[in-house]
């Protein structure tokens, strides 16, 4: 009976995710039979979030919204170890905008989903950000400096990442 | 080649206002803010403040503020300044200056002398 | 605001020599620092930017350096043409500031 009234409020869990998410991949996390996480597929996952490439070419805000109508928002880097594993899916010829961006120009960088902006946890290439007039972030790759971040222009299109919190059942 | 064309010298007077042009050339003028910069006579550069020419807004020197007004008009890719309750210290070159890559004002405009007299 | 010191205001040299300029910045700039040749007709150009790198057309007699608070401007093998007053500027922080300027005459 346990078992059925939790298999019950999963299936009605998934179902809210279903408009946006058909497919879930699932695993269980630890022994507890009664934990799963979920991202959807074919997003990657990382610690307690997922991950997904936008591939079409947007600016910042048809980006954001993009990511939005998934459940997730541009992607927000806490850490390097987080950044090392985004990096692993991009592709080096290519620039993926993030979640930060600088509204007023007045290099007041801040992250989407309000997280505070720390000075000491960026990845800017040597010399960025160095625009008042670029006031959106990307991440791309330097062949003097690998993966790093680059202030650029709002409305020039790019390709993105979203990230979202994983979806526990 | 890039080019920034000032309107011409102006006298006013005390309490009055004065609205300044900076027409830009050679360039996409909303690709880059439009700075300006005041010089009094033997005196050094002082930063005024700067406008987005692609989003409109503006940031400026807290000393600047509630004298001078920035806004651009895209369609004749000019920028204008207009300082309002001009007193004799006001008195200065007005320059315009594009914004560039590294915190920089890379192109600048000849300069407008604006003199404040009764 | 960050306050930036030319500490010479005017400087006197020969055609021919190597001329150095300094700022000094009262907090550190982190290499945002940009160097303007202002003419006596007062055209402003700008030289150098982000503290050593050379602006489109400037000639290679002029040179950029520092770190920090502390940055110079050199001119080796002064021309006549290099009579001017010469700025610095720092972009790390709004309100930019220039320094107070260094008039640089001919002997």
């Known amino acids: 009976n346990f078992m059925y009234s939790k298999t019950v409020k999963r299936l009605s869990k998934l179902r809210e995710y279903q408009q946006y998410h058909p497919s879930l991949t699932c695993v269980m996390e630890g022994k507890d039979i009664e934990d799963w996480s979920c991202c959807p597929t074919p997003w990657t996952s990382f610690q307690s979030s997922c991950y997904f490439i936008s591939t079409g070419m947007q600016s910042w805000t048809k980006s954001q919204k993009n990511c939005s109508v998934m459940g997730a928002d541009l992607v927000v880097i806490n850490t390097r170890e987080e950044q090392d594993f985004i990096i692993q899916n991009l592709k080096r010829n290519s620039s993926y905008f993030l979640g930060l961006s600088d509204p007023g120009g007045r290099r007041h960088w801040q992250w989407v989903d309000q997280t505070p902006y720390n000075e000491n946890v960026t990845f800017w290439h040597s010399g960025e950000p160095n625009n008042l007039d670029e006031r959106c972030a990307i991440i791309n790759f330097r062949s003097s400096e690998e993966w790093g971040w680059n202030d650029i222009h709002c409305h020039v299109p790019q390709k993105s990442i979203c990230k979202m919190k994983k979806i526990y059942i | 080649q890039v080019q920034l064309q000032q309107s011409g010298a102006e006298v006013v007077k005390p309490g009055a206002s004065v609205k300044i042009s900076c027409k830009g050339s050679?360039?996409?003028?909303?690709?880059?803010?439009m700075h300006w910069v005041r010089q009094a006579h033997a005196k050094s550069l002082e930063w005024i403040g700067v406008?987005?020419?692609?989003?409109?807004?503006?940031n400026y020197n807290q000393k600047f503020k509630g004298k001078v007004t920035m806004t651009v008009d895209t369609s004749s890719s000019t920028a204008y300044m207009e300082l309002s309750r001009l007193r004799s210290d006001d008195t200065a070159v007005y320059y315009c200056?594009?914004?560039?890559?590294?915190?920089?004002?890379?192109?600048w405009g000849q300069g407008t002398l604006v003199t404040v007299s009764s | 605001d960050i306050q930036m010191t030319q500490s010479t205001s005017s400087l006197s040299a020969s055609l021919g020599d190597r001329v150095t300029i300094t700022c000094q910045a009262s907090q550190d700039i982190s290499n945002y620092l940009n160097w303007y040749q202002q003419k006596p007709d007062g055209t402003v150009k700008l030289l150098i930017y982000y503290t050593s790198r050379l602006h489109t057309g400037v000639p290679s007699r002029f040179s950029g350096s520092g770190s920090g608070t502390d940055y110079s401007l050199t001119i080796s093998n002064l021309d006549q043409e290099d009579i001017a007053t010469y700025y610095c500027q720092q972009g790390n922080t709004l309100p930019w500031t220039f320094g107070g300027g260094t008039k640089l005459e001919i002997k």
């Open positions: 200056a594009r914004n560039g890559n590294f915190y920089v004002m890379d192109y």
């Open positions: 406008i987005s020419t692609y989003y409109g807004d503006s």
């Open positions: 050679g360039y996409t003028f909303t690709d880059y803010s």
